[in-house]
């Protein structure tokens, strides 16, 4: 069958029909429905929402909708023994205690089952000691403390401000520095935008607001007790001592009212420079310990949370493809929230719901996509991407053979300024072409394309007249598909004009104040940005599932490979003497990139010219495109990170949210001047260049003519 015969409608009309069916009012209605009560992973509330979504997706017209459950390690506060932090005097009396809960927002005073702020997976403990302020607790912050300021964190409780990097990296850094506890807080410098009121009068964080979140260092493992395999009924579970990624010291988050009380008494060293000062009226002294009058006072943490194996539920919907049912395009986003989930995740889940409804409407009119579309409502994303990872582990053999693309659908908005896209280079042209066809929702860009407003507001740093598209990092459900399985992936959302705080999130992130009203009153009253994101995500899925030739351009991978090779070479060239001494050469990598570029160019020429009416040749060419991303996977994974297997991209070892290019080489070079055995260290650099060069060459060869 030809594609048109299978789908009954001309391709152009299909896409227009799909996009025209998406309605802002429906997204608004779905968001309201999804945000009236909390949907914490492992609770009946979230299970009921899973069943509701299952039922509605069936009504919308999907061929099948199933629940997939797993029994994974989650973490919860003790209901009768709350977590808090004290200042204690020399007699051990608690003279100040942090708050036990966030003051509920207006209209939500009577809602039960709001989980109090906690750091998920913190071990239990009641450490007490002197405080050290460690800025953002980044790698460079600890370098500054330990190497420049000669401040020892061993045996201290550290207090770090949220922002810049994933909180799990902060905790890992504190552990490595010898800290015995970590206090995380939101500083107004990072979570209070000037000129905006705090919630409920604006979108800023009030002093009693607190960011929840997990503090794991899973490195892609999924359930900490069953790394590599699904947490099913017959799973063999590791003991808690062997679990992957659990922190070893107590951790607890607080708001800036409570942080003020801790930080105002700090003594010891002054902050090293202005980048260590936030916006509180405190000196931002580093410590250790409190100043003169208060020097006998200590800080004590009281953490009683427990880790429990708990059942979670994914919803998996299928719309069977008419021509290539064994090729899967996946649209997935999570359902579980810390509290109401007004932005994270329900602004994304509402968009997925409307996309499913639109596809279902077309299906009821007799249309089917060329390829199968899978829709997923993931559980337990907030606890370490657990639902998506367990499902992918269970279905890895199918996915690695049949997975065409994965489009992520968490929060649709983190601002209302412009589009933000992170994706594989294979999707650059798809995103460019699609956004040129969509209307911009931005004020001042009426009648203009989304591409135009996006390019104007967020220009590419390398190519004029093009928008910025970022590397995929992690911290969301695409991780297992892209970093472990090598399935081409992408994500899109509306963002803020706040490049400096790229990884801090929006002010009310993971707090009780992330409500429907936050979105409806302050971020997107007309739901026009949500609609645009639905069009981008849905449009990408539509094209990926329905294009006769997959909308991947391998030449764009060639361009970025050259850019990444240049970048890593220049990092290495900061050590010219050692490169000479240890005979470090990047020739093999540059040669492989050159070969990739030439082969990709020839492949693209053949792609223009081949007989698309020959289903065997069409399938062969599409398979070469589909499997290109897979070709960048190293089955052995990255050093000490076996589930990060993509050689070109991995989450940064210093910030899970950020993507790093040629991560194997990058990590081998990182802080190499401090390594005790330079010969061994530079040997590892050479090995990583070899792995990268081989992988790029091998990937190039998958695009060569098959015989």
């Amino acid at each position: 069958k030809s594609s048109n015969e299978a789908t009954n409608i001309t391709p152009k009309h299909n896409m227009k029909a799909f996009l025209d069916e998406l309605k802002a009012e429906n997204i608004k209605k779905f968001l309201y429905n999804f945000t009236q009560i909390p949907h914490l992973a492992g609770t009946e509330q979230n299970f009921q929402l899973a069943k509701q979504i299952q039922s509605q997706w069936k009504e919308f017209g999907l061929d099948s909708v199933e629940l997939a459950h797993y029994d994974v390690l989650l973490s919860y506060p003790n209901k009768t023994h709350p977590n808090y932090i004290s200042i204690i005097n020399e007699d051990g009396n608690e003279i100040f205690n942090t708050s036990l809960f966030e003051p509920p927002p207006p209209g939500y005073e009577n809602v039960s089952d709001i989980v109090p702020p906690f750091s998920a997976f913190s071990p239990q403990g009641m450490p007490e000691g002197d405080l050290v302020y460690v800025n953002y607790a980044r790698t460079e912050d600890f370098f500054k403390l330990e190497r420049d300021m000669k401040i020892n964190c061993s045996g201290k409780i550290v207090i770090a401000r949220y922002g810049k990097v994933f909180r799990g990296n902060k905790v890992k850094n504190a552990q490595l520095a010898g800290a015995k506890g970590v206090i995380l807080y939101s500083d107004p410098a990072d979570y209070f935008a000037p000129g905006v009121k705090s919630y409920p009068d604006g979108w800023n964080l009030p002093g009693g607001g607190v960011q929840r979140g997990n503090i794991l260092n899973l490195n892609g493992a999924g359930d900490p007790l069953t790394p590599g395999y699904p947490a099913n009924e017959y799973a063999y579970r590791r003991g808690i001592a062997e679990a992957v990624g659990l922190p070893s010291i107590p951790v607890h988050p607080i708001g800036y009212y409570d942080a003020q009380k801790l930080l105002e008494k700090m003594g010891g060293s002054a902050p090293p420079d202005s980048s260590w000062r936030g916006s509180l009226k405190v000196p931002y002294n580093v410590g250790p310990g409190f100043t003169g009058n208060f020097s006998t006072q200590k800080v004590k943490m009281h953490i009683h949370s427990t880790n429990e194996v708990t059942r979670i539920y994914n919803v998996i919907g299928t719309l069977r493809g008419a021509v290539e049912p064994d090729r899967y395009v996946i649209l997935g986003g999570h359902r579980d929230s810390w509290v109401f989930g007004g932005i994270d995740p329900q602004s994304g889940a509402a968009v997925v719901h409307e996309i499913v409804r639109s596809f279902g409407t077309l299906k009821k009119e007799g249309w089917r996509p060329r390829r199968t579309i899978l829709f997923a409502s993931w559980d337990a994303e907030e606890f370490g991407l657990l639902g998506s990872t367990e499902w992918a582990e269970e279905n890895s053999r199918l996915l690695q053979e049949r997975g065409v693309a994965y489009i992520n659908a968490d929060s649709s908005i983190e601002g209302n300024y412009t589009l933000r896209v992170d994706c594989t280079p294979l999707m650059y042209s798809l995103v460019h072409n699609l956004t040129k066809e969509l209307k911009s929702p931005d004020e001042g860009f009426e009648g203009k394309s989304l591409y135009e407003s996006w390019t104007k507001k967020s220009p590419s740093p390398e190519f004029s007249g093009m928008p910025r598209i970022s590397k995929l990092g992690s911290g969301n459900d695409f991780e297992v598909f892209f970093q472990r399985l090598g399935i081409a992936s992408g994500r899109a959302r509306y963002t803020k004009n706040w490049e400096t705080n790229k990884f801090s999130g929006y002010p009310l992130y993971h707090s009780v104040y992330e409500t429907y009203e936050l979105v409806e009153k302050f971020y997107d009253p007309m739901f026009k940005y949500h609609l645009t994101v639905a069009q981008v995500r849905g449009g990408m899925v539509f094209e990926l599932a329905n294009s006769i030739v997959l909308p991947f351009d391998c030449r764009d991978y060639a361009v970025v490979l050259r850019k990444y090779a240049d970048k890593i070479y220049s990092i290495s060239m900061k050590h010219p003497q050692e490169m000479k001494t240890y005979s470090v050469s990047f020739d093999s990598l540059f040669s492989a990139v050159k070969n990739f570029t030439e082969i990709a160019s020839k492949f693209s020429e053949r792609l223009q010219d081949f007989d698309k009416s020959n289903p065997i040749v069409l399938r062969m060419m599409n398979d070469q495109l589909m499997f290109l991303e897979r070709a960048f996977i190293d089955p052995l994974g990255l050093p000490d990170r076996p589930f990060y297997r993509h050689v070109i991209y991995a989450p940064s070892s210093h910030n899970k949210y950020a993507g790093e290019s040629f991560p194997g080489i990058y990590d081998a070079l990182f802080d190499i001047e401090s390594k005790v055995d330079p010969s061994k260290a530079w040997g590892e650099v050479k090995r990583q260049i070899y792995v990268a060069a081989f992988t790029v060459q091998a990937a190039a060869e998958t695009l060569s003519e098959v015989a």
Epitope: I37, P38, L40, G42, T43, E44, Q45, N46, F47, H69, D71, L74, Y76, K79, T80, N110, V111, S112, D113, V115, E233, E308, V309, T310, R311
Partner: antibody, heavy 121, light 107 residues
Framework: EVQLVQSGAEVKKPGASVKVSCKAS????????ISWVRQAPGQGLEWMGE????????YYNEKFRGRVTLTADKSTSTAYMELRSLRSDDTAVYYC??????????????WGQGTTVTVSS | DIQMTQSPSSLSASVGDRVTITCRAS??????LNWLQQKPGGAIKRLIY???SLDSGVPSRFSGSRSGSDYTLTISSLQPEDFATYYC?????????FGGGTKVEIK
Amino acid sequence: EVQLVQSGAEVKKPGASVKVSCKASGYTFTSYGISWVRQAPGQGLEWMGEIFPRRGNTYYNEKFRGRVTLTADKSTSTAYMELRSLRSDDTAVYYCARVFDGYYNYAMDYWGQGTTVTVSS
Amino acid sequence: DIQMTQSPSSLSASVGDRVTITCRASQDIGSSLNWLQQKPGGAIKRLIYATSSLDSGVPSRFSGSRSGSDYTLTISSLQPEDFATYYCLQYASSPYTFGGGTKVEIK
């Protein structure tokens, strides 16, 4: 259709033990727990305890701790409540009820039909 | 233990009447309260969970609400099949406790 079917009525002598069963069907047994509640003649309802078969955890009302044992057989989707050292004031209708296995739940949604236990010398 | 004080213990009403039953909690239970119906034969059915959410299949004449520590079950228009005993149940903290019951009889 969710169903909880309890075993038949029992007559026991003081000091004896009774074991009441509750067979579940129409849902995934290990996704839920079973609570046990009793009602003495003409009286109100009293919660005795609950068991979560997936993880084997049991929680008891202090009033019954040491006298009651809750168990579950996952292979047959059946929960059991054994009450020992029976007294005349244990004469009651004993109910099982389904409860979601999770950190927060909405307590008992479906109930068994009840089992009458009479303790009489 | 949390005490649940239910009132009235019994009431007589006619078909079509509006009926309200109240439970007062001795401690804060948030919205962790259910309403149960027990028919004369002994069968128990949950009507409302989490203070105000209606179970599937339960007629919309039943509703639940809260004011402070007082929780109310309302039957907007009593039907013949509604004559039964009604209990509140708090599940905020263990041991879970029930109100004493309200028997709704035909006037």
